[in-house]
Interface confidence: low
């Protein structure tokens, strides 16, 4: 049989807390256990859920766990089921509400002299106990007019008077803990004697000299009084007006006009109304000055047939807000249709070149108008005037290429050689029209050219091949002056080009012929063994057929290259002693000899007590020093060559003799000793 | 708090017309371009029509010729005239305030007002 | 006549997977981005998510994103939450030069794997 060792039982809980229902059950075989509420059976949530046998409730909740709970236990192999005892909760809760008007039905009906009754929607188990306040202040029962009925949480007010006015609020506590309301009733209840807003004065914005009317009337009884003042707290009445404001009418049902507005006027002007008791109602009002700033200037614009397009228009500043529209040719845009205006903004859809222009953006308040045009451009595909020809440029010469074009606006040309973009430099110049001008034409520019025209529109382009026609030239030129060294074998060459192949031979400048041992091979003046009689001025001619002929001067020089009979040598020398450099160079021209020291060549005109060079050539520092040590050059040169030889300088500290050493040892190094 | 509220809907015979109330609180609704969309049951959003700062109007192909959208600022309040009313015009009417007088993108709605068009 | 596809028009899916919605019109926006997205629940009003293509609405959360120029656009929403399964609606504005002044797209319903 199955038995209950732990029955549920009926309890208190506390809304929102944790709760248990407990259950345990013994049995001969396994059994099942599982929840009844009010005879149905208990789903599991995550708020309430079985706990082994028990039945855990993370949150009571007043509405989903109020009814009877029972345990059941089932043997499914058996059949058996048992059922626990009944058990329930005592749920305590107490939750906020709002303070609503219970009588007279609507607050409109609220009159002076008539019961009130409010109501506050607390509610709780066990029912709570309430506290009712008044702008804060509690309101103890039987006080004042007023009874506060527990039971039915009501608050009467009989009758009510404008003493009454406020804001009423409630309070409720229970076992469970405390509330008050979530919204709050304001009672109004108007004393007859105090003045009401009837017709409030309005913000007015007038154009400068028209005129402005504030409205302004109150209610009371008696009647109230009501008088306007300007911003200064000056007043305004028909017998005493202050100097500025001498146009001011004020009526009978209290309405100020102002006539002939000036900036000065402008400002707040006060309505105050006072009735026999309460205090003054002020209301305000602001007449402000019509005005209008200048509108921003447009920048061209250039459009594409076919595009939709859109200009915007910057309203400008202005009282009241200015009204925008635009124009086309004197006639105001629609609001649809191809070209049309939507907001502030122009709206160009499928642009046609008719739509080119000038369209005018207007701008209007009381204060008068603004306008401002923008000049729209349809942009259209560039055509050709001239497209650039196949050209044969003559080298050295200026040279040009057209590429006329029409288009709008003005095209834009841009021109490329072999596919690279020209930049303007000293040889290319691309003029307005698009022409390209090569201003000395070289060899290599024969190639291709081509030139894009462009709008916003789209583009063509063409292209054209440049063939250079060649000057006869000396490739390179020869050098005028030229050395041979005697007695060696000798060569020198001369070469040109031009249209047709040029030819070339030598002669001497004075028309004798070439000796026997002196060759002209192909431009090539070739001597086998180089002589005194050979040194003189030779002239070298290329000629072709088309181009006639040009020459070259050339005056050969006979020279003994120079070989140096003495070279400087690796020196070593006592810091504060006497350094000596050799040189000695020979050859034909005499050469001259020149010093480099520590990289700078060193001029006898500038070298200092120290140094001297000999006629000799060589090199001489007296009382050497540490920053003398370096690399020594010396450089032998004539009209026909150069040659240069160099040795190190070293300076060292002169050594104090050690007793091991004998006077007579020598230093380990080769020393010039003075 | 700002809203927009629709009102004027309810049954009516093909054929007859009707006239829907937009009205604002909190907002002027005269600065702003307002929007009429309608859902038929079931089904997606339909834009019927747009009345601009300035009064310009603009309507759906569907829509021309038998509505009208019209504004009275005093009021703070836009009508939509619905005339020649057929079956496949019931729908839940939304009116719709744009972000700006240059911008039709909605960014306020009303809760829709019910339009059953039956015999 | 202007077009809004969107696409896909219904969407299964589960709460933390991202989802892409697309919504393609038969030709250029107005400025090129003048699109919103709209998420409804029904018996509601439409609520904005997302305008001028990419911008997020006030008190809308970071999860949602738009994006696209000109034709085409797509709203993410980076990791599904419960409270988004709903019905989300494309709105673009075109020049209202062949009258066409709003469109908006035929809805792609989002709902729970």
């Known amino acids: 049989a199955i038995v209950f060792i732990k029955q549920p039982s009926s309890q208190d809980a506390l809304q929102g807390r944790r709760a248990l229902l407990r259950c345990e059950v013994e049995a001969p075989g396994p059994v099942h256990v599982y929840w009844l509420l009010d005879g149905a059976p208990v789903q599991d949530t995550e708020r309430r859920f079985a706990q082994g046998s028990s039945l855990s409730f993370a949150a009571v909740d007043r509405l989903q766990d109020s009814g009877t709970f029972q345990c059941v236990a089932r043997d499914d192999v058996t059949g058996e089921e048992a059922r626990s005892a009944n058990a329930s909760f005592n749920i305590k809760w107490i939750e906020a509400g709002p303070v609503v008007l219970k009588h007279p039905a609507s607050e409109a009906e609220i009159q002076p002299q008539t019961q009130v009754t409010l109501r506050c929607h607390i509610d709780g188990h066990p029912r709570p106990t309430y506290q009712w306040f008044r702008d804060g202040t509690p309101l103890s029962d039987g006080q004042s007019n007023h009874t506060v009925s527990s039971k039915e949480r009501n608050l009467t007010l009989r009758p009510a008077g404008p003493e009454h006015s406020g804001l009423y609020s409630c309070c409720a506590h229970s076992a469970f803990g405390q509330a008050c309301s979530s919204q709050n009733f304001t009672l109004s209840i108007a004393d007859e004697s105090f003045a009401r807003v009837v017709l409030a004065p309005q913000d007015v914005v007038v154009a400068r000299y028209e005129e402005a009317m504030f409205h302004c009337q109150f209610s009371a009884q008696p009647p109230p009084s009501l008088q306007w003042l300007f911003e200064d707290e000056t007043p305004i009445t028909n017998r005493s007006r202050p100097p500025h404001l001498r146009r001011a009418t004020v009526f009978a049902n209290g309405s100020l006009l102002l006539t002939q507005v000036r900036p000065r006027n402008a400002g707040i002007y006060r309505c105050i109304g006072q009735g026999q008791r309460g205090p003054p109602i002020i209301l305000e009002a602001t007449l402000h000055l019509a005005e209008i700033e200048d509108m921003p200037l447009f920048e061209p614009r250039v459009f594409t047939a076919g595009s939709e397009e859109r200009v915007t228009c910057l309203p400008p500043k202005g009282l009241p807000e200015p009204s925008v529209w635009w124009e086309h040719a004197g006639v105001r845009l629609p609001t649809h249709g191809r070209v049309y205006q939507k907001g502030h903004e122009l709206v160009l859809a499928n642009i046609a070149e008719s739509d080119a222009g000038v369209y005018t953006c207007h701008a209007a308040n009381l204060a008068g108008q603004r306008r401002q045009d923008v000049n729209i451009t349809v942009a259209t595909v560039p055509s050709w005037l001239k497209k650039p020809q196949d050209s044969q440029l003559e080298e050295g010469k200026p040279g040009y290429l057209d590429c006329l074009t029409q288009a709008t606006p003005k095209p834009t040309v841009v021109w490329y050689r072999n596919q690279m973009l020209i930049s303007e430099d000293s040889r290319f110049e691309v003029f307005k029209n698009g022409t390209l001008r090569i201003n000395s034409v070289e060899v290599y520019d024969g190639t291709w050219y081509r030139c894009m025209s462009s709008t916003p529109a789209g583009s063509i382009e063409a292209q054209a091949r440049v063939q250079v026609l060649e000057k006869l030239k000396f490739t390179p030129p020869p050098q005028p002056q030229q050395c041979m060294e005697f007695d060696k074998e000798a060569t020198v060459p001369c070469s040109a080009t031009g249209r047709e192949k040029p030819t070339i031979k030598w002669e001497r400048a004075d028309g004798s012929s070439l000796p026997e041992w002196v060759t002209d091979n192909a431009g090539t003046l070739h001597f086998a063994r180089v002589t005194r009689d050979d040194a003189g001025n030779y002239t070298c001619i290329a000629s072709n057929g088309p181009q006639g002929q040009i020459r070259a001067h050339v005056q050969l020089t006979v020279a003994v290259f120079i070989t140096f009979k003495v070279e400087p040598e690796r020196t070593t020398v006592y810091q504060g002693h006497t350094a000596l450099l050799q040189c000695e160079a020979q050859g034909d021209p005499k050469p001259l000899i020149q010093w480099k020291g520590k990289d700078r060549i060193l001029d006898p005109t500038k070298l200092g007590p120290r140094m001297h060079i000999f006629q000799n050539g060589s090199l001489v520092i007296h009382d050497v020093a540490p920053e003398d040590s370096g690399r020594y050059t010396c450089i032998a040169g004539n009209s026909c060559n150069i040659k240069h030889t160099e040795a190190p300088l070293y300076v060292v500290d002169k050594p104090v003799p050690e007793e091991s050493e004998g006077p007579g040892s020598p230093p380990p190094y080769k020393m010039i000793q003075t | 708090e700002v809203q927009l509220v629709e009102s004027g809907g309810g049954l009516v015979q093909p054929g007859g017309s009707l006239r829907l109330s937009c009205t604002a609180s909190?907002?002027?609704?005269?600065?702003?371009?307002v929007i009429w969309v309608r859902q038929a049951p079931g089904k997606g959003l339909e834009w019927v029509g747009i009345?601009?700062?300035?009064?310009?109007?603009y309507y759906a192909n569907w829509a021309k010729g038998r509505f009208t959208i019209s504004r009275d600022t005093s009021k703070n309040t836009v009508y939509l005239q619905m005339n020649s009313l057929r079956a496949e015009d019931t729908a839940v009417y939304f009116c719709?305030?744009?972000?700006?007088?240059?911008?039709?993108?909605?960014?306020?709605w009303g809760q829709g007002t019910l339009v059953t068009v039956s015999s | 006549e202007i077009v809004m596809t969107q696409s896909p028009s219904t969407l299964s899916a589960s709460v933390g997977d991202r989802v892409i919605i697309t919504c393609q019109a038969s030709?250029?926006?107005?400025?090129?981005?003048?699109l919103a997205w709209y998420q409804q629940k029904p018996g509601k009003a439409p609520k904005l998510l997302i305008y001028?293509?990419?911008k997020l609405a006030s008190g809308v959360p970071s999860r949602f994103s738009g994006s696209g120029s000109g034709a085409e656009f797509t709203l993410t929403i980076s990791s599904l939450q419960p409270d988004d399964f709903a019905t989300y609606y494309c709105?673009?504005?075109?020049?209202?030069?062949?009258?066409?002044?709003?469109?908006f797209g035929q809805g792609t319903k989002l709902t729970v794997l």
């Open positions: 719709a305030r744009s972000f700006s007088d240059i911008s039709d993108l909605i960014k306020l």
């Open positions: 909190g907002i002027d609704l005269s600065n702003y371009a």
């Open positions: 009345i601009y700062t300035y009064d310009t109007t």
């Open positions: 030709q250029s926006l107005y400025n090129n981005k003048a």
């Open positions: 001028e293509a990419s």
């Open positions: 709105l673009g504005e075109f020049s209202c030069g062949s009258g066409d002044c709003l469109a």
